[in-house]
Interface confidence: low
């Protein structure tokens, strides 16, 4: 556990009056309907919502939506519909709005049913002023900003064609025809699939993979043969119908499809699925799903290649294509993720790893829970966290888990306490070291945030009622005060703050029903009169992450290096500050056989750590290859993690071997690659 | 502002003791771990002892350990050096100083003087 | 024992910028050696500027960084200032023994 002081809980001085001067209601003049709020740049303070409001009549629905724009972190709200003349925006495309802090907004708006093409709004001052543009297409799916220049969209329309825009929006052109998907890629690179026959659905095995690094000038056709793609990190995936039969492999690339390699992995049949869970530069999680309708599947994490896969997790919860995982990365702790696994007797247990999948375990018992009728043993039991597939299920889960890379170790869960996740009403749980220990925090389900990089959380309770009462913490989750915003309760539907978790501005949105209306209304109240002092150095106290055994010398150890944190000690009241920057400080470990994982042709027997030479190549090992072509393949049986940074130590070199061998794929060999220009 | 104040230092007979004190303001003294360092005449600098942030490790160079003996009080704010059976090779200025792990920077006293002679 | 190795003295002039580093005979510095330079003055005033690498200390001009060059710890002064002339300690921190000292660096800004 993160260090804290244990003190009783003391009450932050004159709370009610330093909030109720800091809390701002905005009665929305508006039937209720559905409601969509937008954050436009980051430290700007300037919200975007959007209410629709469609009305059915005899033969069609007549829509009406209305947009308000705050520039005070949703203090103040002014009515900007006039802006867009009064037209009614689509909510499915929602709000595009552009990257980083480019203030671009695209609003997509509903035309008649002759119309040649769509149209759209777009603003580039933070939605200050909009212009109307006219689109020679119909959109089929919301405009994409290139990560690199925000100028830079594209968007497919309902025929299937790739539209491309190089000044944000107010000019487009067609680059390309029969387009299944397209992605923006690094460098203003666009990847995207064709299919040449019928449709997207009846060429699937048999689409192509294009790519085009000049906005459609040029392209060159990367794959052939093709299932579907996706980018993680700095790898490019394929996964590729096989020469004889239905089955499909993932290929991967580095080169932005240059050259490929078949990725180590089990090849999978039509109804199954490969699913990229986690991806960042060094590694990729990589789900397969199992043959049959099952649920489950494997983890796989990869070399720094994505080439060679080491199993990572069996009976992964993952119900079905695009269905529901609870794999999550746990952002406020490097190398933790939480899933859940689906057991033999068909219950749902959480694992968690510490070292980016390299082992799983389950979720410590808190301290403060009994085990519940779950349990077989009442003495022995964990947590289990409620994620994605419990909210799928209904399950009386508001929210999924939380943590924010600001505010270090903090990990925020609704959860049960026993064998296996429980259909019983949950608790909300804390951790504040980043997953090894929790804590109960809350009793029964909440809506919670997290403020001024943890300096603060806020938890609403999940209730059919109406409400008026906000909980608060100064403390991580300890002690919690309670604050009733306003007299007359509100039907609860939300609770905003800005994204990064630096703000300390919370809203509540809800609404009101009367005899004859309901209207939506917003409550933001700022915290800073509660936090009144800026942060200084005795507030903060050193903290080792993944500290287990203080004794130890390696302790903290993970992926190579171990980090030392800076904390805000739980009983200081103060601001971290829109400015925090965590304060951390790596220190690289010595090297041991834990941070190096079999190269391929090598393998670890059970309870060795030693890599050893697999007698024979056979199965889906045969097939593998490097860059689709013959390779001699030169190995000493162990590559470094990928991340790892650890130094001296263990030094696993040995002979370094060649395991000559044919690649059975020619699937991407150069002579089938070709490019052309427009 | 941070301060690290030190006195005790004096002149003394080789075998004889002195007790170093070292008052801490300006920062969570235990938070820290503290060191004791000291110059010798011909200017080197040479770390002495080191005392975990709640007092429970404390570690000595081979030069004094078994003579020297760190301790803090962190209710008073306060680091100690308990030097005994001093050598004419311990005269030195000392230093009470917060030596910097990975998080901290560094900040030094104003030393005090020990002269070990017959 | 590890040795801690230092230049035994450098000149700069106002304006110039210069470094100054740090060995050790055991091997490259790291991170894990969490380098600490201190100033001393004369009459025996010792200002902590850095702490674990490249931490500066409350107070110390930014003109004033640490950082790993090569296998070295290294103290850069980038625009030197006349008062920056001092003798500069830097401590190297090792698992075994714990602080170890360099000889100091005797700068000089003319």
């Known amino acids: 556990s993160a260090p804290g002081e244990d003190e009783e809980c003391g009450r932050v001085r004159d709370f009610v009056a330093k909030l109720a001067n800091n809390t701002h209601q905005h009665v929305f003049d508006d039937l209720r309907g559905s409601v969509s709020l937008s954050w436009v740049g980051d430290s700007t303070g300037v919200i975007l919502v959007l209410t629709t409001f469609h009305v059915p009549l005899v033969i069609m629905t007549f829509g009406q939506s209305k947009l308000y724009r705050s520039e005070d972190y949703g203090k103040n709200f002014k009515d900007i519909t006039d802006l867009i003349n009064n037209t009614f925006i689509r909510t499915e495309f929602g709000m595009a709005i552009g990257p980083e802090n480019s203030g671009k907004v695209v609003l997509t708006a509903e035309v008649s049913g002759g119309s040649r093409g769509g149209r759209i709004f777009r603003s580039s001052d933070f939605a200050k002023n909009f212009v109307q543009t006219d689109l020679p297409f119909h959109p089929l799916t919301q405009m994409m900003y290139s990560p690199q220049n925000s100028d830079y969209l594209l968007a497919l329309s309902t025929e299937n064609g790739l539209w491309v825009s190089k000044n944000f929006g107010g000019k487009w052109e067609e680059i390309h025809k029969a387009v299944c998907l397209a992605k923006w890629g690094s460098d203003n690179t666009i990847f995207f699939t064709t299919y040449a026959n019928g449709s997207c659905k009846a060429d699937l095995g048999a689409l192509e993979l294009w790519r085009t690094s000049d906005l459609g000038k040029s392209f060159k056709t990367i794959g052939v043969k093709i299932y579907s793609f996706g980018l993680g990190g700095r790898f490019l995936f394929a996964s590729v119908m096989a020469d004889k039969d239905t089955t499909r492999r993932i290929h991967v690339s580095t080169d932005q499809g240059d050259t490929w390699s078949m990725a180590q992995l089990p090849s999978v049949g039509q109804e199954q699925f490969y699913s990229i869970l986690a991806a960042n530069d060094d590694m990729v999680f990589m789900h397969v799903d199992e043959p049959g309708d099952t649920g489950f599947g494997t983890i796989f994490t990869s070399d720094d290649r994505g080439i060679v896969y080491s199993k990572s997790l069996d009976r992964h919860l993952y119900t079905t294509t695009g269905g529901e995982t609870d794999f999550t990365n746990v952002t406020s702790l490097r190398g933790v993720y939480i899933t859940s696994v689906l057991s033999e007797d068909n219950s749902i247990q959480t694992m968690i790893t510490f070292d980016q999948g390299g082992r799983w375990t389950h979720l410590r018992k808190p301290e403060n829970s009994e085990c519940d009728a779950t349990a077989k043993n009442k003495n022995e039991c964990s947590l289990h966290i409620h994620a994605s597939y419990s909210i799928s299920q209904k399950l009386n889960v508001p929210m999924a888990p939380l943590s924010e890379p600001n505010a270090v170790g903090i990990v925020i869960a609704h959860g049960s306490v026993g064998d296996a996740i429980s259909v019983m009403v949950p608790d909300v749980y804390i951790s504040d070291d980043g997953g090894y220990s929790w804590t109960k925090m809350l009793e029964g389900p909440h809506y919670y945030t997290i403020l001024d990089s943890g300096g603060i959380i806020v938890a609403i309770e999940h209730s059919s009622r109406p409400i008026n009462v906000i909980k608060f913490s100064t403390d991580e989750g300890q002690c919690w005060q309670t604050y009733t915003f306003t007299r007359d309760p509100i039907y609860f539907t939300g609770l905003a703050s800005e994204p990064g978790a630096r703000s300390m501005n919370i809203s509540i949105w809800g609404f009101t029903e009367s005899f004859l209306t309901s209207q939506w209304v917003s409550y933001t109240i700022d915290f800073k009169d509660i936090l009144e002092r800026n942060c200084e150095e005795k507030d903060y106290t050193i903290w080792l992450a993944h500290s287990t055994d203080p004794e130890d010398y390696e302790d903290g150890c993970i992926l190579g290096y171990k980090e030392q944190f800076l904390r805000l000690r739980k009983s200081s009241v103060c601001q971290n500050g829109r400015d925090y920057v965590v304060t951390k400080q790596p220190s690289i470990c010595l090297c041991s056989l834990e941070d190096f994982l079999c190269d391929f042709g090598y393998y670890r027997p059970e309870n060795d750590s030693k890599c050893v030479e697999q007698p024979e190549l056979k199965g889906h090992d045969l097939e593998f290859c490097l860059y689709g072509r013959e390779e001699h393949l030169t190995t000493n049986g162990y590559r470094k993690i990928p991340g790892d940074k650890c130094q001296g130590g263990v030094n696993p070199v040995r002979e370094v071997k060649d395991l000559k061998k044919k690649c059975t794929s020619n699937f991407l060999s150069p002579e089938k690659q070709n490019s052309k220009s427009n | 502002e941070v301060q690290l104040v030190e006195s005790g230092g004096d002149l003394v007979k080789p075998g004889g003791s002195l007790k170093l004190s070292c008052a801490a303001s300006?920062?969570?003294?235990?938070?820290?771990?503290m060191s004791w360092v000291r110059q010798t005449p011909d200017k080197r600098l040479e770390w002495v002892a080191i005392?975990?942030?709640?007092?429970?490790?404390?570690h000595y160079p081979d030069s004094v350990k078994g003579r020297f003996t760190i301790s803090r009080d962190n209710a008073k704010n306060t680091l100690y050096l308990q030097m005994s059976s001093l050598k004419s090779e311990d005269t030195a200025m000392y230093y009470c100083?917060?030596?910097?792990?990975?998080?901290?920077?560094?900040?030094w006293g104003q030393g005090t003087s020990v002269t070990v002679s017959s | 024992q590890a040795v801690v190795t230092q230049e035994s003295a450098l000149t700069t002039s106002p304006g110039e910028t210069v470094t100054l580093t740090c060995r050790s005979s055991?091997?490259?510095?790291?991170?894990?050696?969490?380098a600490n330079w201190v100033q001393e003055k004369p009459d025996h005033l010792f200002t902590g500027l850095i702490g674990g690498t490249n931490n500066r200390a409350p107070g110390v001009p930014a003109r004033f960084s640490g950082s790993l060059i090569g296998d070295k710890a290294a103290l850069t002064i980038t625009g030197a200032q006349t008062e920056d002339e001092a003798i500069y300690f830097c401590a190297l921190w090792y698992s075994n023994h714990f602080w170890v000292f360099g000889g100091g660096t005797k700068l000089t800004v003319l």
């Open positions: 100083a917060r030596l910097c792990g990975p998080l901290c920077s560094g900040y």
């Open positions: 055991t091997g490259a510095v790291t991170t894990s050696n969490y």
């Open positions: 005392i975990s942030s709640g007092g429970s490790y404390t």
């Open positions: 300006g920062f969570t003294f235990s938070s820290y771990g």
